[in-house]
C-alpha cells in the first residue's frame, strides 16, 4: 500500500496515449 504521506504526489508510469500525447512515454498523474 502507498504510504499516506505519498498520496498527494503524482505517480509516474510508462504508458501509451497518456498525458494528452499520442506516443508512449512516461506520464505523471496525481
Amino acid at each position: 500500500r502507498r504510504r499516506r504521506r505519498d498520496t498527494h504526489f503524482p505517480i509516474c508510469i510508462f504508458c501509451c496515449g497518456c498525458c494528452h500525447r499520442s506516443k508512449c512515454g512516461m506520464c505523471c498523474k496525481t
Epitope: 504526489f9 510508462f14 501509451c16 512515454g25
Partner: antibody, heavy 121, light 107 residues
C-alpha cells in the same frame, strides 16, 4: 544556477557496499523526478534507477534490481544510491540526472559531473 | 530484449549537414531524446520528444522519429559540435534505453 553534484565514489572490493550522494541546488528538488545513470570507462550510457515524487514510486534496471536502492531526502535536497553486493561490472562513472519538469518527463535535462566507482580486488 | 542501435562514427565537413540515426523496434511509437557528450564532460540534452529543443540549444540541431528510426540532424556543423551523441527512449517503467553512441568528427 541549477546544479547537481555527486559524491561518494571510490575504489571498493567486490561484494562490498557504497553509498553515492547527489546534492541539488538552484531548483525545487521535490518537484522533480531524479535518475541515476552510469557510464563504464569508454562505453555508452546505462540507466540505473529513477525515483519520482513519491518515495514509493521508484524503478530499477534489471542489472541492479535487488542490489541497489535509490532514495531521496527532500529536506536536504539530496538524492542517494545505496549500492550493495558490488560487482566488477558495476565499475563506471555514476551520474545523477534530473527528469524534465511536467506531466510527461521523458528526458534527462540536467546532469551532474559524475562520480567514479571502481570495483576491484 | 530491446536495443537502440547507432552507427559508431559519423564524419562531416564544417558547414555541412550531419545526420545521426538511432534504430530500434517500434522506436517511432516512443518519444526519443538526444544527448551530446563532449570528451571528459557530462551529457547535455539537445533534443527531446523527438524534435523539441531545450532553451540554449542552437537551431541547427533538429530531430525526427518515425517507423523504427529516430534521426538527429545538425545543419551547418561547427567544430564545437564534435562529440559523442546518444539517443534515448523509454520502453517500460523499468527499461530506459540508450543507444551505443555515435562519435561525430568534424573534419
Amino acid at each position: 544556477q541549477v546544479q547537481l553534484v555527486e559524491s561518494g565514489g571510490g575504489v571498493v572490493q567486490p561484494g562490498r557496499s557504497l553509498r553515492l550522494s547527489c546534492a541539488a541546488s538552484g531548483f525545487t528538488f521535490s518537484s522533480y523526478g531524479m535518475h541515476w545513470v552510469r557510464q563504464a570507462p569508454g562505453k555508452g550510457l546505462e540507466w540505473v534507477a529513477v525515483i519520482w515524487y513519491a518515495e514509493s514510486n521508484k524503478y530499477y534496471a534489471d542489472s541492479v534490481k535487488g542490489r541497489f536502492t535509490i532514495s531521496r531526502d527532500n529536506s536536504k535536497n539530496t538524492l542517494y544510491l545505496q549500492m550493495n553486493s558490488l560487482r566488477a561490472e558495476d565499475t563506471a562513472v555514476y551520474y545523477c540526472a534530473r527528469a524534465q519538469e511536467g506531466i510527461a518527463p521523458d528526458a534527462f535535462d540536467i546532469w551532474g559531473q559524475g562520480t567514479m566507482v571502481t570495483v576491484s580486488s | 530484449c530491446y536495443e537502440l542501435t547507432q552507427p559508431p562514427s559519423v564524419s562531416v565537413s564544417p558547414g555541412q549537414t550531419a545526420t545521426i540515426t538511432c534504430s530500434g523496434d517500434k522506436l517511432g511509437e516512443r518519444y526519443a531524446s538526444w544527448y551530446q557528450q563532449r570528451p571528459g564532460q557530462s551529457p547535455v540534452l539537445v533534443i527531446y520528444q523527438d524534435s523539441k529543443r531545450p532553451s540554449g540549444i542552437p537551431e541547427r540541431f533538429s530531430g525526427s522519429n518515425s517507423g523504427n528510426t529516430a534521426t538527429l540532424t545538425i545543419s551547418g556543423t561547427q567544430a564545437m559540435d564534435e562529440a559523442d551523441y546518444f539517443c534515448q527512449a523509454w520502453y517500460s517503467s523499468t527499461n530506459v534505453l540508450f543507444g551505443g553512441g555515435t562519435k561525430l568528427t568534424v573534419l
